[in-house]
């Protein structure tokens, strides 16, 4: 998390800044949502605990052709220490239910806001 450059300013970005920018992007998505996000695409829900950023990316990376979440996908890749490819799921990612991308984004946003308030930037 020491090298999360490329989102708003060049060079390394502090974890708190990177998290705030991710939250802002998710807020932007939810507020600008007119038609169903990503045409109602469904993705695997995630456990919002350990390995959350990689798990979120593992779910969202499978959705292609949805410009609304492309920036979120890029930002999440900065939080995940390993490369994630479509169709790849770690052992931590329990695939037990699929939800619409819009709900996924809302759930993720609520959790990230909580982490930010608590000062958990990693």
């Amino acid at each position: 998390l020491t090298c999360l450059g490329g989102f708003a300013s060049p060079g390394p970005v502090p974890p708190s800044t990177a998290l705030r920018e991710l939250i802002e992007e998710l807020v932007n998505i939810t507020q600008n949502q007119k038609a169903p996000l990503c045409n109602g695409s469904m993705v695997w829900s995630i456990n919002l605990t350990a390995g959350m950023y990689c798990a979120a990316l593992e779910s969202l990376i499978n959705v292609s052709g949805c410009s609304a979440i492309e920036k979120t996908q890029r930002m999440l890749s900065g939080f995940c220490p390993h490369k994630v490819s479509a169709g790849q799921f770690s052992s931590l990612h329990v695939r037990d239910t699929k939800i619409e991308v819009a709900q996924f984004v809302k759930d993720l946003l609520l959790h990230l806001k909580k982490l930010f308030r608590e000062g958990q930037f990693n």
């Epitope: 169903p36 045409n39 109602g40 695409s41 469904m42 993705v43 499978n62 959705v63 169709g87």
Partner: nanobody, 116 residues
Framework: EVQLLESGGGLVQPGGSMRLSCAAS????????MDWVRQAPGKGREWVSS????????WYADSVKGRFTISRDNSKNTLYLQMNSLRAEDTAVYYC?????????WGQGTLVTVSS
């Protein structure tokens, strides 16, 4: 162009069985995870089940686990949903979907009504 055509719906009594089919065309069916999604009258869309490209991996919503079985025949480009022990709350329009694509790529759906 992706096309998905569901069939097999209808009226069935509680406790009965029904098998839905979905004929796929316009993409390499065997390469993709597939979903069944349903929408009950006046409700939102609910994920029912998914199956991996080869058919060896399957997943189910808790509400249908042990009652529904998803399967596929890649030689026929067809997806199936065997539904047993049907309940009134299973009444819905059932859609098959190419996973991770929006409802622009879903079929028109088939209505399943569970009623005595």
């Amino acid at each position: 162009e992706v096309q998905l055509l569901e069939s097999g719906g209808g009226l069935v009594q509680p406790g009965g069985s029904m098998r839905l089919s979905c004929a796929a065309s316009g993409f390499t069916f065997r390469d993709y995870e597939m979903d069944w999604v349903r929408q009950a009258p006046g409700k939102g869309r609910e994920w029912v089940s998914s199956i991996g490209p080869s058919g060896s991996e399957t997943w189910y919503a808790d509400s249908v686990k042990g009652r529904f079985t998803i399967s596929r025949d890649n030689s026929k480009n067809t997806l199936y949903l065997q539904m047993n022990s049907l309940r009134a709350e299973d009444t819905a329009v059932y859609y098959c979907a190419k996973a991770y694509t929006g409802f622009g790529y879903w079929g028109q759906g088939t209505l399943v009504t569970v009623s005595s």
